[in-house]
Amino acid sequence: CDLPQTHSLGNRRALILLAQMGRISPFSCLKDRHDFGFPQEEFDGNQFQKAQAISVLHEMIQQTFNLFSTKDSSATWEQSLLEKFSTELNQQLNDMEACVIQEVGVEETPLMNVDSILAVKKYFQRITLYLTEKKYSPCAWEVVRAEIMRSFSLSKIFQERLRRKE
């Protein structure tokens, strides 16, 4: 399964789309900036089996997909870019699912890294809570967009390390 190569390209396309989605100057949103506590340590470990690593990446993409699939998101972002972004994420999710099955065998259940997946879930809960507290304001969404761009960039480094390990 050559997921890291294909996923890296998909990640790059997703990053480009995220960059294009910006609709408000971040310089007007400095008062709203926030530290969401990206779970860096979950993307630092070399202890992962490939299937486990993919399951953590899958969770991050899934949570991002969920976040940008809400009606509040639809009301914020330019529709055609949002659709392209969602399609890109969906393709990545499908690729990952196929890859995990290939890695562990159809009959086996992949050993999920429960703690890492929980850390990613909590990270996105913090993002959702922030948006709620800020009443889904344009600046709040801009801050979240910047955060997701950074988390994608950091996961890209993780994927590249995964590829080197192979």
């Epitope: 480009i16 960059a19 910006g22 949103c29 008062k31 926030h34 530290d35 993002i127 950074r150």
Partner: antibody
Framework: EVQLQQSGGDLVKPGGSLKLSCAAS????????MSWVRQTPDKRLDWVSI????????YYPDSVKGRFTISRDNAKNTLYLQMSSLKSEDTAMYYC????????????????WGQGTSVTVSS | DIVMTQAAFSNPVTLGTSASISCRSS???????????LYWYLQKPGQSPQLLIY???NLASGVPDRFSSSGSGIDFTLRISRVEAEDVGAYYC?????????FGSGTKLEIK
């Protein structure tokens, strides 16, 4: 290895124009915000302008607003500073700098700097 | 604009001993998100500035742990635990809390 190679500095008369360039390599240029910072003859650092990674948004302090324009060409991995209506107080060493990826906390730390290019405004 | 104030020179220090450089801002740099947007840069003679510290107390990549920084939100101190000859240069504090971003005038580290 991250590199920012600068060019375009020169001696120019008051009221004149100049365009500075900063060629980036060793990183995904289109993913990073960039700034220009100048160092005056008395060695003070003076932040001049900033541009977002995609180039859609810019900001300038009042001292250069309306006279300086920051831009970028992500296809060419190059940052620019167009300076017009130059004054003697614009005389400085101009540095381009890359901003660290800040995410939602918008950390605009300048983690890499070019070697600088000298601009002298004098009649 | 936020004004960053620094002394022009540090107290002269002996190699191997500790040094402190101070900086004061005209407004608290502590954001409601808990981050203090204070930065330290070092410019060695004949070189471009380099990032030392970000968000008041975090060491930038490749910076030796002899460097540390602390502060209250308005008053900040950069400490060098064992000064080496290569630490000579001008130290600038800067703020990224508000636009326009501003720098201190720089403090030159003096060696005895």
């Amino acid at each position: 290895e991250v590199q920012l190679q600068q060019s375009g500095g020169d001696l120019v008369k008051p009221g004149g124009s100049l365009k500075l360039s900063c060629a980036a390599s060793g990183f995904t240029f289109s993913s990073y915000g960039m700034s220009w910072v100048r160092q005056t003859p008395d060695k003070r650092l003076d932040w001049v302008s900033i541009i977002t990674s995609g180039g859609s948004y810019t900001y300038y302090p009042d001292s250069v607003k309306g006279r300086f324009t920051i831009s970028r060409d992500n296809a060419k991995n190059t940052l620019y500073l167009q300076m017009s209506s130059l004054k003697s107080e614009d005389t400085a060493m101009y540095y381009c700098a890359r901003h660290a990826e800040g995410g939602g906390n918008y950390d605009y730390a300048m983690d890499y700097w070019g070697q600088g290019t000298s601009v002298t405004v004098s009649s | 604009d936020i004004v960053m104030t620094q002394a022009a020179f540090s107290n002269p220090v002996t190699l191997g001993t500790s040094a402190s450089i101070s900086c004061r801002s005209s407004k608290s740099l502590l954001h409601s998100n808990g981050i203090t947007y204070l930065y330290w840069y070092l410019q060695k003679p004949g070189q471009s500035p380099q990032l030392l510290i970000y968000q008041m107390s975090n060491l930038a990549s490749g910076v030796p742990d002899r460097f540390s920084s602390s502060g209250s939100g308005i008053d900040f101190t950069l400490r060098i635990s064992r000064v080496e000859a290569e630490d000579v240069g001008a130290y600038y504090c800067a703020q990224n809390l508000e636009l326009p971003f501003t720098f201190g005038s720089g403090t030159k580290l003096e060696i005895k």
